[in-house]
């Protein structure tokens, strides 16, 4: 009996009610592998989700996010609100990056400016909410008498490690 079911191809299910005949998946359901006893319900892309690929008898629907949102998780299981560059998402929505951090994307979290001194370099261009600092040559690399490219350090929030 098991062998009869294993002959059922993707897009069908082994119908116990009909002497284990291979029946096509009903509308809005699919089976992506052979030998299945039931078909899975198609995913529906509603609300903040939009359909990227329609469901077929052999494959599930694939969802994307509507404009202003982006996918999160495996197979776009969640849609997360986009923020502007220089912001990050919090419980209350999009908030500007704290001083000393930046985000150059519409998604994700604010990250600290690069610590130029870790590589023995100096800050060539100050960081902003949207952009990381640009590191330049170390102060020792500047020729004698040349003015330093390092701008004056801005005031910092408590907790931020100075560059």
């Amino acid at each position: 009996l098991q062998d009869l079911c294993s002959n059922c191809p993707a897009g069908t299910f082994c119908d116990n009610n009909r002497s284990q005949i291979c029946s096509p998946c009903p509308p809005n359901s699919f089976s992506s592998a052979g030998g299945q006893r039931t078909c899975d319900i198609c995913r529906q892309c509603k609300g903040v989700f939009k359909t990227r690929k329609e469901c077929s008898s052999t494959s599930n629907a694939e969802c994307d996010c509507i404009s202003g949102y982006h996918c999160l998780g495996a197979e776009c299981s969640m849609c997360e609100q986009d923020c502007k560059q220089g912001q990050e998402l919090t419980k209350k929505g999009c908030k500007d990056c704290c001083f000393g951090t930046f985000n150059d994307q519409k998604r994700g979290i604010c990250r600290p400016w690069t610590n130029c001194s870790l590589d023995g370099k100096s800050v060539l261009v100050n960081g902003t909410k949207e952009r990381d600092v640009v590191c330049g040559p170390s102060p020792a690399d500047l020729s004698p008498g040349a003015s330093s490219a390092t701008p004056p350090a801005p005031a910092r929030e408590p907790g931020h490690s100075p560059q």
Epitope: L72, E80, E88, L89, T90, K91, K92, K95, C98, G100, T101, G108, I109, C110, R111, P112, W113, T114, N115, L118, D132, E157, G159, H160, S161
Partner: antibody
Framework: QVQLQQSGAELAKPGTSVKLSCKAS????????IYWVKQRPGQGLEWIGN????????FYGEKFMGKATFTADTSSSTAYMLLGSLTPEDSAYYFC??????????????WGQGVLVTVSS | QVVLTQPKSVSTSLKSTVKLSCKLN????????VHWYQQHAGRSPTTMIY?????PDGVPDRFSGSIDSSSNSAFLTINNVQTEDDAIYFC??????????FGGGTKLTVL
Amino acid sequence: QVQLQQSGAELAKPGTSVKLSCKASGYTFTSYYIYWVKQRPGQGLEWIGNIWPGNGGTFYGEKFMGKATFTADTSSSTAYMLLGSLTPEDSAYYFCARRPDYSGDDYFDYWGQGVLVTVSS
Amino acid sequence: QVVLTQPKSVSTSLKSTVKLSCKLNSGNIGSYYVHWYQQHAGRSPTTMIYRDDKRPDGVPDRFSGSIDSSSNSAFLTINNVQTEDDAIYFCHSYDSTITPVFGGGTKLTVL
């Protein structure tokens, strides 16, 4: 699967330093904050600071500026915390933890097993 | 400075319901997410509730989280308390997105 493996227990003398490690595996090390948290025996959790391994950028709690120094080695996916000028008050468990990149006020989804630092002469 | 205040200890009986509180001293409890961790003696914390009321995979549905803006507090409710729930529970939120804050922890004793 995601794991944060911390180094072993440390016994140190007052005035010396210890360097604790936190080796990450199972995810892209450079794309998540690593936080360091202190817990004195029988006490609460205290934020020490955090590092973004992608560029070495750091934040420190007011109380731990000058006490803790964070670094990260991306080649070995390991975060380090150097604790300097040790006193008996630094005797505690130290945990590293990862924060997801979902939101700026998110939880710590994975924790290291913790390392006990004992400062005694 | 933002402070999260938790009762030091709470005792409850087996199979009862207990509600642990976490009160924010200033600002609005709704401004940032609140998370809850469980810590057994000699172990690292594990997440029981994240983003106010979400439960990670593997955490029993006996655990739930809520926010009450009128008391400026977050709550962790445990239904049908079991002996393995005997642990310390910490709440966690933020002062700013670069400054996490923890409550002092509540030692839950199951009688």
